[in-house]
């Protein structure tokens, strides 16, 4: 037995990490990263905060919560099967061994293939870079993602055809959004 | 298996001292926080504070401040709580559990009871 | 400290129903809200953390749902054996804090 935290190949993947700030907007230092904590600070470090700010990060890592309340949570941004190990959350309280050290252990699993509707098919077929998954935990949401590349008058297809299919129905009903832009 | 053994039940004179025993078995001690928890019939749980096994490091709910002092023994693999100036108000069951925000594995309880 | 209401302090409902127990927050929590089940006589087990995430080996009727300061635990087919009182408990703070507990009966 042992809690594990899980994500399929494409999602967002969460990490939970929290700690009770001393007083509102005193922070400590976070940092995250891959590998097991060591004795000080973090081993390949994925993202770090400061007393004030995030401070550094790399891509497809970033902090959805309000770090300033003490949410440290991490979001892994499309996970592939690679994202899976061990992650390290520390906060690095001041004085001497003062730091948390949390362990968490991510386990990515390869995508189902579910069969689609024709008409949602034809639709990620026309538009095959929309369709992304966003959010985490069992009941997962989708969301259509930002548009590159797309021109105005696809815009204006894409519309149409949302308004006329399934799809529309299905995204409204799980609180979908489109992002232009 | 993981396992977190409790003695089941300490009977205490008011004014006295208990020392509660949590004994883990079946995973590494000192990779998971211990937590205590206490339980009154109708009132629910409460969270009394918790150790880091590893670096001895503390944190308790104000409320239990004075009155539990956490503690572990690393090669025994066992950790602590102790009860000091016993009242009836201290008459619950204690649970260990372990992991760092919430608690996957529970003690098996202790009962204690505070009379004269 | 944050206070976790559970509102229902008592629920009864049929085998094979299915029931959602609520619990709200005195704060924003995120989704940072575990729920327990407690059997009589037994301690209490870990089934849902995270808000949504099932742990190791709990059946698939458990759910939990919900982020911000509301929060939901759903048993989606009743069975005689989930007769028990189930705790939320908000693992975003310090002092950590648990609902009252809600018991579940089984008609």
């Known amino acids: 037995s042992e809690v594990e935290y899980r994500a399929e190949v494409g999602q967002n993947a969460y990490l939970p990490c929290f700690y009770t700030p001393a007083a509102p907007g005193n922070l400590v230092p976070v940092c995250w990263g891959k590998g097991a904590c060591p004795v000080f600070e973090c081993g390949n470090v994925v993202l770090r905060t400061d007393e004030r700010d995030v401070n550094y990060w790399t891509s497809r890592y970033w902090l959805n919560g309000d770090f300033r309340k003490g949410d440290v949570s991490l979001t892994i941004e499309n996970v592939t099967l690679a994202d899976s190990g061990i992650y390290c959350c520390r906060i690095q309280i001041p004085g001497i061994m003062n730091d948390e050290k949390f362990n968490l252990k991510l386990v990515i699993k390869p995508a189902k293939v579910t069969p689609a509707p024709t008409r949602q098919r034809d639709f990620t077929a026309a538009f095959p870079r929309m369709l992304t998954t966003r959010g985490h935990g069992p009941a997962e949401t989708q969301t259509l993602g930002s548009l590159p590349d797309i021109n105005l008058t696809q815009i204006s297809t894409l519309a149409n055809e949302l308004r006329d299919s399934r799809l529309a129905n299905d995204l409204r009903d799980s609180g979908a959004t489109i992002r232009i832009g | 298996q993981v396992q977190l053994q409790q003695p089941g039940a300490e009977f205490v004179k008011p004014g006295a001292s208990v020392k509660l025993s949590c004994k883990a078995s079946?995973?590494?001690?000192?990779?998971?926080?211990m937590h205590w928890m206490k339980q009154r019939p109708g009132r629910g749980l409460e969270w009394i504070g918790r150790?880091?096994?590893?670096?001895?490091?503390?944190k308790y709910n104000e409320k239990f401040k004075n009155k539990a002092t956490l503690t572990v023994d690393k090669p025994s693999s066992t950790a602590y709580m102790q009860l000091s100036s016993l009242t009836s108000e201290e008459s619950a069951v204690y649970y260990c559990?372990?992991?760092?925000?919430?608690?996957?594995?529970w003690g098996t309880g202790t009962t204690v009871t505070v009379s004269s | 400290d944050i206070v976790m209401t559970q509102s229902h302090k008592f629920m009864s409902t049929s085998v094979g129903n299915r029931v959602s127990i609520t619990c709200k927050v005195s704060?924003?929590?995120?989704?940072?809200v575990a729920w327990y089940q407690q059997k009589p006589g037994q301690s209490p087990k870990l089934l849902i953390y995270?808000?949504?995430y099932r742990y190791t080996g709990v059946p698939d009727r458990f759910a939990g749902s919900g982020s911000g300061t509301d929060f939901t635990f759903t048993i989606s087919s009743v069975q005689a054996e989930d007769l028990a009182v189930y705790y939320c408990?908000?693992?975003?703070?310090?002092?950590?804090?648990f609902g009252s507990g809600t018991n579940l009966e089984i008609k």
């Open positions: 150790i880091d096994p590893d670096s001895g490091g503390t």
């Open positions: 079946g995973y590494t001690f000192t990779s998971y926080w």
């Open positions: 559990a372990r992991y760092y925000w919430f608690f996957d594995i």
């Open positions: 995270s808000a949504s």
């Open positions: 408990q908000q693992h975003f703070n310090t002092p950590f804090t």
């Open positions: 704060q924003d929590v995120s989704t940072a």
